[in-house]
Interface confidence: medium
């Protein structure tokens, strides 16, 4: 069963001092975001018992395994059902506490009733404040039964439930007709899924015989021990004031467990701590009684004395629950109450016994849950005991359950049952996740969901190059940390798998599914430098660079040019996707801007060192484009261009620039300055006959302006002259014959 305890502090004189605490002894309980355990939940359950709304209750977490509910302002806040949920996965368990008002009309003689399937349950509500009306019994909030007020017996209303079945479990209440629900007596009925002493799916298995008021769990056959007792059969008492499956928890406060109600997983329910009784768990046991709710009687023999927390304390020479066994009778010594092994292992189990006559090897045997008897393979005989060693055949899941060590001599016999848990080694259900990669390393998250049993003690990461037959490399990592695989080959696929282990021999699980993780390319190491740059317009920049000469192939896929505009805080990146390129034209830049420029080599996603930066100032933007540009052939070597001045000029034009290019030609265009800005025509001379030319022009003020539209015109051929006179501008004319 899950080690989960719900503690209710029953000092009811002041509701503000009331608190509920849920304590988990489970490994990793309550860490919440931690992948190995969901959080503890502690809340009031208003589905059945509804109370008037009040200020919200305060929840405080104390470390990973404890949560406390406070903030009760009035007694009615306390009445009802509270639940704590803890444990992970299939072990998630709900513990329930039912609180009754001490001032209610009816009070339960006993709040929690645990009965076996087929038993008769009797709920008894004691009259605290009499009303001469019917008593209504409800089950889980719905009407169940009516009792006439005359039907009280010795001041109690009894509800008899014959032949109860598990669906009968739940919260029962007895209320006088028309009385406030807060004046009800609330009960909790827990019906085990099997008859007395049985457990398992078909109730075919025999319970271990839980001692000291422990209750056999109908699903797993384990004893749910009362607070203050431990061991497979609850045979061992904790020290006063301690509780939990291993007695690891301590009752708060100087008065120990006085005034505390303990609620444990079903089918136990709730009770006072060991040594205490009464509706508020504030009364010590009467002489001769001990245990939770003081339900147990000592009946000590042979001079034993009764301790209200642990039962009989035997004098020297005697042992047993009632000090009824002489030390001459053989006795199993120091047998662990619970052992854990991994599936398919072949463990050795030791069983030690003493007595008079002295036990020998053949007098000690080990019995498995299926009845198979194992004989010891060797025995170690010491003056005070004989220890028999048993070699257990390969374990299967069916070996989980109660084993028994038995010693028999002529002096009598003794046996000790102990629980064997066969655990399934964990197997990852998913592949590890790649977090980041570099050329020679991979960062991996090994944390994956798994089948089988925890806790996870170690995580092994196995990896090797894909399609390789070489041995796997292995790294052992902490389950909760990411791991870096180092010294890998660049640009290489690696198969990576997780293997989980749990504690103990044979705890290594099978390897999980593989995943392919690929390292990055090698980083480019060459640092380029900027050879030069020139402005080709207010928004265009031609850049050239070089690389140092090194032997071997170039490690790189291309270049990245970066332009940083410090004024605006903007970066422009230009990708040049050929590693052979040494020049690039950057367009669409912002005129009049001061840029910082650098270039770096890249390979895959990795960048090499950047060149030393250069600082470039683009000229400010020029005027708008000239309008209505027109070309007219004058001869076989002359074409006249006419235009209109740009509109909305920001200042006086300093010159025009004409661009001349042979149509369909592959060469660079030629630029010709027109230095007389007041002119609106010019003659371009020295052209080739019968050749088609493209013309466009732009004006300049401080910087060059936008280009005009492009016009086409062909020079004349065969010596033909154009008609009409020609007026030419005094433009600078250059021959275009080359």
């Amino acid at each position: 069963a899950v080690d989960l305890t719900l503690l209710a502090n029953l000092r009811l004189t002041d509701p503000q001092r009331f608190f509920l605490t849920c304590v988990s002894g489970e490994a990793g309980a309550g860490r919440g975001s931690d992948a190995w355990g969901p959080p503890l939940l502690l809340e009031k359950d208003d589905r059945i018992v509804r109370t008037p709304p009040g200020p919200p209750l305060r929840l405080a977490r104390n470390g990973s395994h404890q949560v406390t509910l406070r903030g009760f302002s009035k007694p009615s806040d306390l009445v009802g059902v509270f639940s704590c949920v803890g444990g992970a996965g299939a072990r998630r368990t709900r513990v329930i506490y039912v609180h009754n008002s001490p001032g209610a009309h009816l009070l339960p003689d006993k709040v929690t009733h645990t009965v076996n399937k087929g038993d008769t349950a009797v709920l008894s509500a004691r009259v605290h404040k009499e009303k001469q009306t019917d008593v209504i019994w409800k089950s889980n909030g719905s009407y169940f039964y009516t009792l006439d007020w005359h039907e009280a017996q010795d001041g109690r209303f009894l509800l008899q439930l014959p032949n109860v079945q598990p669906p009968s479990s739940g919260i029962y209440s007895a209320t006088y007709l028309e009385a406030s629900p807060l004046g009800s007596a609330f009960f909790r009925l827990i019906v085990r899924g099997c008859g007395a002493g049985r457990w398992g799916p078909g109730c075919t298995k025999e319970c271990p015989g839980c001692l000291h008021g422990g209750v056999c769990h109908d699903h797993d056959g384990e004893c749910v021990c009362p607070p203050g007792f431990t061991g497979t059969r609850c045979e061992q008492a904790c020290r006063e004031g301690r509780f939990g499956q291993s007695c690891q928890e301590q009752c708060p406060g100087i008065s120990g467990c006085r005034g505390l109600t303990f609620c444990l997983p079903d089918p136990y329910g709730c009770s006072c701590g060991s040594g205490w009784r009464g509706s508020q768990c504030q009364e010590a046991c009467a002489p001769g009684h001990f245990g939770a709710d003081c339900r147990l009687q000592c009946q000590c023999q042979n001079g034993g004395t009764c301790d209200r927390f642990s039962g009989c304390v035997c004098p020297s020479g005697w042992h047993g629950v009632h000090c009824e066994k002489s030390d001459r009778i053989p006795q199993i010594l120091n047998m662990a109450s619970e052992l854990e092994f991994n599936l398919e292992t072949m463990p050795r189990i030791n069983c030690a016994a003493a007595g008079n006559p002295f036990p020998v090897r053949g007098s000690i045997e080990l019995r498995k849950p299926d009845g198979t008897v194992l004989l010891s393979t060797k025995a170690i005989v010491e003056p005070e005991k004989t220890t028999a060693e048993f070699e257990v055949p390969r374990l299967v899941l069916a070996d989980s359950g109660f084993w028994e060590c038995r010693v028999s001599t002529s002096g009598g016999q003794d046996s000790r049952r102990f629980k064997v848990n066969v655990k399934v080694p964990p197997v990852p259900l998913a592949a590890p996740r790649l977090l980041t990669k570099q050329s020679r390393q991979l960062v991996v998250s090994p944390l994956v969901s798994f089948s089988g049993d925890g806790p996870i003690s170690t995580v092994r990461l196995h990896y090797r190059p894909q399609d390789s037959t070489m041995d796997w490399s292995t790294i052992v990592v902490d389950p909760s940390e990411n791991v870096t695989l180092m010294n890998l080959r660049p640009k290489t696929g690696y198969s990576v798998r997780v293997q989980l282990s749990r504690p103990g021999e044979g705890g290594e699980g099978a390897w999980g599914p593989p995943t392919l993780m690929t390292t990055d390319c090698p980083e480019p190491l060459l640092q380029p430098w900027l050879e030069g740059w020139h402005v080709e317009g207010t928004d265009r920049l031609r850049v050239s660079w070089s690389l140092p000469l090194v032997p071997g192939p170039l490690v790189g896929d291309g270049f990245l040019l970066r332009l940083w505009d410090g004024t605006r805080g903007q970066e422009r990146r230009e990708n040049v996707s050929s590693p052979q390129a040494r020049t690039a034209l950057l367009t669409g830049l912002t005129p009049g801007t001061h840029y910082q420029l650098d270039v770096q080599l890249y390979h895959c996603t990795l960048l090499g060192p950047a060149s030393p930066p250069a600082h470039v100032l683009l000229p400010p933007s020029g005027p708008p484009a000239p309008r209505h540009l027109h070309a007219q052939a004058l001869s076989d070597s002359e074409i006249q261009l006419t235009w209109k001045h740009p509109e909305a000029l920001p200042g006086p034009i300093s010159k025009y620039v004409v661009e001349v290019q042979v149509a369909g030609g592959a060469g660079d265009p030629l630029w010709i300055d027109v230095d007389r800005p007041e002119e609106t025509s010019t003659i371009i001379r020295g052209l080739n006959a019968s050749t088609r030319y493209l013309f466009r022009m732009r004006a300049s003020i401080q910087g060059l302006g936008d280009w005009s539209n492009t016009v086409e015109e062909s020079t004349l051929g065969n010596g033909l002259q154009a008609e009409g006179p020609v007026q030419e501008s005094r433009a600078a004319e250059e021959g275009l014959d080359q």
Partner: antibody
Framework: EVQLLESGGGLVQPGGSLRLSCAAS???????KMWWVRQAPGKGLEWVS????????HYADSVKGRFTISRDNSKNTLYLQMNSLRAEDTAVYYC???????????WGQGTLVTVSS | DIQMTQSPSFLSASVGDSVAITCRAS??????LAWYQQRPGKAPKLLIF???TLQSGVPSRFSGSGSGTEFTLTINALQPEDFATYYC????????FGQGTKLEIK
């Protein structure tokens, strides 16, 4: 569906006896308080008797000592044994399921008892 | 015994009207009171229990109030099917019915 079906009514002479039955279905009969209520022709309702699930009984003063209410939980049946009948006992007799939370929430259609010579 | 007195004995109203019927107990019955509707030739039908709690399936135009000795059944926006006889019943000490109020169409 909850159903209550009365039977056993009829004509009887003064001083005679009659046993009424009420067959219950559609609910767990053994958990509920049950009533007999009667209504004389053209008159109002009059509570006659009640019985708790455990068998505790109560009677109206007008029938005390003459009528006996009983139940058989195994047969899901309520009974009213009427002795020493008088003319004023003439009425439609209804059985009703008693207070879930103080009210008869289901009633039968009634059976007519006529006491006349 | 506890006596229950209902008033009025007869009540005339029209469809759409609102009406109130009063029930007095001869001693304090807390809220142990139920109201029933009975149509001619039919069994009574529970409308209200615990003085003011509406039985499931009963229209919300019916409402109950009061505690101790004075109780009222109110029907708002009368519908044709509401014309019937209404009874109160105390359940504080055994049981007693009021003499009934016949609600007729005006």
């Amino acid at each position: 569906e909850v159903q209550l079906l009365e039977s056993g009514g009829g004509l009887v002479q003064p001083g005679g006896s009659l046993r009424l039955s009420c067959a219950a279905s559609g609910f767990t009969f053994s958990y509920y308080k049950m009533w007999w209520v009667r209504q004389a022709p053209g008159k109002g309702l009059e509570w006659v008797s009640s019985i708790s699930p455990g068998g505790w009984t109560h009677y109206a003063d007008s029938v005390k000592g003459r009528f006996t209410i009983s139940r058989d939980n195994s047969k899901n049946t309520l009974y009213l044994q009427m002795n020493s009948l008088r003319a004023e006992d003439t009425a439609v007799y209804y059985c009703a399921r008693g207070p879930v939370s103080s009210g008869g929430d289901y009633w039968g259609q009634g059976t007519l008892v006529t006491v006349s010579s | 015994d506890i006596q229950m007195t209902q008033s009025p004995s007869f009540l005339s109203a029209s469809v759409g009207d609102s009406v109130a019927i009063t029930c007095r107990a001869s001693q304090d019955i807390s809220r142990f009171l139920a109201w029933y509707q009975q149509r001619p030739g039919k069994a009574p039908k529970l409308l209200i229990f615990s003085a003011s709690t509406l039985q499931s399936g009963v229209p919300s135009r019916f409402s109950g109030s009061g505690s101790g000795t004075e109780f009222t059944l109110t029907i708002n926006a009368l519908q044709p099917e509401d014309f019937a006889t209404y009874y109160c019943q105390q359940l504080s000490r055994y049981s007693t019915f009021g003499q009934g109020t016949k609600l007729e169409i005006k």
